[in-house]
């Protein structure tokens, strides 16, 4: 399972898309800026083994695969490009599946923190709360955006647990 | 470290061309905005405008726009302010400084150094 | 373009003392304000963020508050290192506007 280095290039190319599919200069839209409150300290204080680290970029993958599959996402952006992050991260979802029958067996669950996935689980619910709030505004998207692509980023703790060994 | 290095004190005369910079490093350099501070000799902090070096977007300030123009080249992780043509009342203090952009992070939270641009015949 | 006003222009105060500047802006900027600290010679320096929110390494000794128009910068114990002018910062909107200072000097 060479999960690192596959994972790390999709990811890549899902941050390139995400970057790509803004429509509207990002400086109209400070007024709309949120504390969306990404559990980084949690994550970062935490030593993930792989079966977790897995499981917990899954739900963040599966989670914005979700909130960029709605009607609101397609109204929101350009159709092909769309399209093309959601494949990206299909693809990711599958790769980490694939993954973890992999590293545990196709018997075993994998061990789930669930205080991380409910923290990543509460993350996306605000942000799709916000959403809601500013009616799936042409900026709130915008901020939504930044904010996937800096919890992207923020991930580094978890993909250093997908080097380690368990 | 997250750093700002920008480019060394410049002494011009009026009418001729200047191009400062502003050196990101510590950080990725596109996930953040740069943002051109002025400050004249003995005076407050006046807010240029302001670069998305991830595709180049800028946005000036009234007062500024049509007088300087900002730039970044992402691969060498900078940032530019330059004049076509400068007056004596350019001479002051430029600072570079770090923008979280639509994220919930401190505004300016890492300056430049400063530099000094005087302009004299 | 939003317009930023402080009061006191300066103040001179003793080591121990509190300190408060204020800063109003021509139109409610929710909580988008921020205030840096410069001393002479050197690049501001970013202090309180979103009006209230201490940034990473400042002393606590600073606190920010306030909320629409009106927005207040305490020293709750001035030290000697504090000897600076500070600027308030709305960011709500371009162009960022800051205002004209204030100067705390020792008495």
């Known amino acids: 399972c060479d999960l690192p280095q596959t994972h790390s290039l999709r990811n890549r190319r899902a941050l390139i898309l995400l970057a790509q599919m803004g429509r509207i200069s990002p400086f109209s839209c400070l007024k709309d800026r949120h504390e969306f409150r990404f559990p980084e300290e949690e994550f970062d204080g935490h030593q993930f083994q792989k079966t977790q680290a897995i499981s917990v970029l899954h739900e963040m993958i599966q989670q914005t695969f979700n909130l960029f599959s709605t009607e609101d996402s397609s109204a929101a952006w350009e159709q092909s490009l769309l399209e093309k992050f959601s494949t990206e991260l299909y693809q990711q979802l599958n790769d980490l599946e694939a993954c973890v029958i992999q590293e545990v067996g196709v018997e075993e669950t994998p061990l789930m923190n669930e205080d991380f996935i409910l923290a990543v689980r509460k993350y996306f619910q605000r942000i799709t709360l916000y959403l809601m709030e500013k009616k799936y505004s042409p900026c709130a998207w915008e901020v939504v955006r930044a904010e996937i692509m800096r919890s992207f980023s923020f991930s580094t703790n978890l993909k250093k647990g997908l080097r380690r060994k368990d | 470290e997250v750093q700002l290095v920008q480019s060394g004190a410049e002494v011009k005369k009026p009418g001729e061309s200047l191009k400062i910079s502003c050196k990101g490093s510590g950080y990725s350099f596109t996930s953040y905005w740069i943002g051109w501070v002025r400050q004249m000799p003995g005076k407050g902090l006046e807010w240029m405008g302001i670069i998305d070096p991830s595709d180049s977007d800028t946005a000036y300030s009234p007062s500024f726009q049509g007088q300087v123009t900002i730039s970044a080249d992402k691969s060498i992780s900078t940032a530019y302010l330059q004049w076509s043509s400068l007056k004596a009342s350019d001479t002051a203090m430029y600072y570079c400084?770090?923008?979280?952009?639509?994220?919930?992070?401190?505004?300016?939270?890492?300056w430049g150094q400063g530099t000094l641009v005087t302009v004299s015949s | 373009d939003i317009q930023m006003t402080q009061s006191p222009s300066s103040l001179s105060a003793s080591v121990g003392d509190r300190v408060t500047i204020t800063c109003r802006a021509s139109q409610s900027i929710n909580r988008f304000l921020n205030w840096y600290q410069q001393k002479p010679g050197k690049a501001p320096k970013l202090l309180i963020y979103?009006?209230?929110s201490l940034q990473s390494g400042v002393p606590s000794r600073f606190s920010g508050s306030g909320s629409g128009t009106d927005f207040t910068l305490t020293i709750s114990s001035l030290q000697p290192e504090d000897f600076a002018t500070y600027y308030c910062?709305?960011?709500?909107?371009?162009?960022?506007?800051f205002g004209q200072g204030t100067k705390v000097e020792i008495k």
């Open positions: 910062q709305q960011a709500i909107d371009l162009p960022f506007t």
């Open positions: 979103a009006a209230s």
């Open positions: 400084a770090r923008h979280p952009g639509l994220n919930w992070a401190p505004d300016f939270d890492y």
